[in-house]
């Protein structure tokens, strides 16, 4: 297992599969997307990333989904952070939450290979998909709930789809939403979000 020394006092050492889903729409400017990436990397610095502890995936979504890091990628935490920092700014007209939740359900969590770990999708959303794309939204959220995947929506800015955020929250008590007025609030909320995710994950059982 490839490990590196902790970079911060708070360091989440739990059994967790965490997926970062980044809104690639033009509702975020290129500069705002830079702040979003910095937030993801800052969060990753506070996780004990390894195949044994916290596994991470990073996906940018627009009308489709682009995975930059997969849960099973065996790389040093610093290398994974470097890859996350290089996520491309798509600036597309549409970012489909339905499509990315479908991708999370059928691609990322198609097989549950770590039943002992918590599964969380951190949905960073700043836009609203067209109604025609959201027909199966609830179905995908329910599918994720069946697979015990907690969905944590982080609404960013005035165009985040509050209706979808509320629908996600209704599906499970753990699906706590964070609604921010802009990317400038991400840094302020970071520690609270990391703590919340970490508290949802089990500690490793003591060695027998």
């Amino acid at each position: 297992d490839i490990s590196e020394p902790p970079l911060h006092d708070f360091y989440c050492s739990r059994l967790l599969d965490l997926v970062f889903l980044l809104d690639g729409s033009s509702r975020l400017s290129e500069a705002e997307f830079e702040v979003l990436k910095a937030f993801v990397v800052d969060m990753m610095e506070r996780l004990r990333i390894s195949q044994k502890w916290v596994r991470v995936a990073v996906v940018e979504y627009h009308d489709g989904s682009h995975a930059y890091i997969g849960l099973k990628d065996r790389k040093r935490p610093s290398e994974l952070r470097r890859i996350a920092s290089q996520v491309k700014y798509a600036g597309s007209q549409v970012a489909s939450t339905s499509e990315v939740l479908k991708y999370t359900l059928f691609q990322i969590f198609s097989k549950i290979d770590r039943p002992e770990a918590s599964r969380i999708a951190l949905l960073l959303m700043a836009s609203q998909e067209p109604q025609r794309m959201s027909r199966n939204f609830v179905r995908y959220v329910q599918g994720l709930k069946k697979k015990k995947v907690i969905v944590i929506p982080v609404g960013i800015g005035p165009h985040a789809n509050l209706k979808q955020i509320r629908l996600i929250e209704k599906q499970a008590p753990e699906n706590k939403a964070f609604v921010l007025s802009s990317v400038d609030e991400l840094e302020q909320q970071r520690d609270e979000i990391v703590s919340y995710l970490c508290d949802l994950a089990p500690e490793a059982p003591p060695p027998t």
Epitope: S29, E30, A31, K37, A38, R82, S85, Q86, K88, Y89
Partner: nanobody, 126 residues
Framework: EVQLVESGGRLVKAGASLRLSCAAS????????MAWFRQAPGKEREFVAF???????LYTSSVRGRFTISRDNGKNTVYLQMMNLKPEDTAVYYC????????????????????WGQGTQVTVSS
């Protein structure tokens, strides 16, 4: 290859304004995110401001509201308008460019920028 040349730095009094320019040559300028960094004597180089290919901007907290980064794609130039200058703004100011809009990194880290100018000295006296 991108070449960057800064200009506009000089000695000014506290409270004055100054505009730095960074002229770029060598490739498609309009698609490149750019930034200004600065290095004060005896200190490490630090991030000042960022401008995306869409002209969206970011600033370090100490200059927000006083400095403005802008770009003129027709002239292949990025500017840093500095107002209400303070003695603590004294530094060599460097212009930096990404290698492309799509190979990036964290905006406030030096390693995210492939191309650098030689720097221009700004001195603010009290």
């Amino acid at each position: 290859e991108v070449q960057l040349v800064e200009s506009g730095g000089r000695l000014v009094k506290a409270g004055a304004s100054l505009r730095l320019s960074c002229a770029a040559s060598g490739r498609t300028f309009s698609s490149l995110p750019m930034a200004w960094f600065r290095q004060a004597p005896g200190k490490e180089r630090e991030f000042v401001a960022f401008i995306g290919s869409d002209s969206s901007t970011l600033y370090t907290s100490s200059v927000r509201g006083r400095f403005t980064i802008s770009r003129d794609n027709g002239k292949n130039t990025v500017y840093l308008q500095m107002m209400n200058l303070k003695p603590e703004d004294t530094a060599v100011y460097y212009c930096a460019a990404r290698s492309s809009a799509f190979s990036s990194g964290i905006y406030y880290r030096e390693g995210s920028y492939a191309y650098w100018g030689q720097g221009t000295q700004v001195t603010v006296s009290s």
